[in-house]
């Protein structure tokens, strides 16, 4: 089965999404909606996705949710939530994208995607 | 504006051999997986064969297994199907499709089809 | 092999709902794609994610996903729905399309 860790010219698609989430926001993101904080460490992309996912009616983030299930292993549905998740906190949508935006730049910048 | 020609299509003997070709155009064509889905006359959806973005694993269905190859050249932006060996039952229309993001590619949903070319094989 | 089956033929009045089952083993565990097909076209995606509609697909058309089965349900169905649909899924990797079920549009 294909590998677990996404190829640099994947990881910079998504990048490329998020930057344009961030560039292209005017009225608050999804309405200001809000989701729960995750540990960005191994597994973060299927935690980000359940992060997501559970954002409904939000066309700004759709292509994101669906890029994010190309580096999860395993099917994401609403309401499911693994142990990644920092469950106390949750921050808006806005944020969430901003904080793995970051991260992803910063694991780029150092290589870490083979 | 993403899209996707297909071309190399044909009449072909049996046993003959045929190499189908798919340039793409209006997106990172190295980041995405890219299938190949054929169609005989009157028939439903089949899929032939993917070959993943970057990580470059591939995956066969178990009729064309061992007799068609799949190929890319990100330089180029052109996905290829190498057909050898080919029977009476690859008759179809083949389509190439634009597929997942990532090493789960196929988590995605196959979002962008060619118009397809056709693949005859007969005496 | 891993198979998905659809029934081969639903009939449906304009304006009425169309609902297309697709049945595979524990299908609900796997994503689930739904695709549109007119004569002479290339498929189109409708559903992805087992109830998400790409842009440009209208409201009409919505899945769901659960236990064996996956259904693709058109709300208030217009003739130009009337074509040929094809669930799909991944499984040990490959993928698998439905058998297809035809759709008509009576009247």
């Known amino acids: 089965s294909p590998g677990p860790v996404p190829p640099s010219t994947a990881l910079r698609e998504l990048i490329e999404e998020l930057v344009n989430i961030t560039q292209n926001q005017k009225a608050p993101l999804c309405n200001g909606s809000m989701v729960w904080s995750i540990n960005l460490t191994a597994g973060m992309y299927c935690a980000a996705l359940e992060s997501l996912i559970n954002v409904s009616g939000c066309s700004a983030i759709e292509k994101t949710q669906r890029m994010l299930s190309g580096f999860c292993p395993h099917k994401v549905s609403a309401g499911q939530f693994s142990s990644l998740h920092v469950r106390d906190t949750k921050i808006e949508v806005a944020q969430f994208v901003k904080d793995l935006l970051l991260h992803l730049k910063k694991l780029f910048r150092e290589g870490r995607f083979n | 504006e993403v899209q996707l020609l297909e071309s190399g299509g044909g009449l072909v003997q049996p046993g003959g051999s045929l190499r189908l070709s798919c340039a793409a155009s209006?997106?990172?064509?190295?980041?995405?997986?890219m299938s190949w889905v054929r169609q005989a006359p009157g028939k439903g959806l089949e899929w032939v064969s993917a070959?993943?973005?970057?990580?470059?694993?591939?995956y066969y269905a178990d009729s064309v297994k061992g007799r068609f190859t799949i190929s890319r050249d990100n330089s180029k932006n052109t996905l290829y199907l190498q057909m050898n060996s080919l029977r009476a039952e690859d008759t179809a229309v083949y389509y190439c499709?634009?597929?997942?993001?990532?090493?789960?590619?196929?988590?995605?949903?196959?979002?962008?089809w060619g118009q397809g070319t056709t693949v005859t094989v007969s005496s | 092999s891993y198979e998905l089956t659809q029934p081969p033929s639903v009939s449906v009045s304009p304006g009425q709902t169309a609902s297309i089952t697709c049945s595979g083993d524990?299908?609900?565990?796997?994503?689930a794609c739904w695709f549109q097909q007119k004569p002479g076209q290339s498929p189109v995606l409708v559903i992805y994610?087992?109830?998400k509609r790409p842009s440009g697909i209208p409201e009409r058309f919505s899945g769901s996903n659960s236990g064996d089965t996956a259904t693709l349900t058109i709300s208030g169905t217009q003739a130009m729905d009337e074509a040929d649909y094809y669930c799909?899924?991944?499984?040990?990797?490959?993928?698998?399309f439905g058998t297809g079920t035809k759709v008509t549009v009576l009247g």
């Open positions: 994610h087992d109830s």
């Open positions: 070959f993943s973005g970057s990580g470059g694993s591939t």
């Open positions: 499709v634009q597929d997942g993001l990532g090493p789960y590619f196929y988590n995605y949903g196959m979002d962008v």
């Open positions: 799909q899924a991944w499984d040990s990797s490959t993928y698998v």
């Open positions: 524990k299908l609900g565990d796997k994503y």
């Open positions: 209006g997106f990172t064509f190295s980041s995405y997986a």
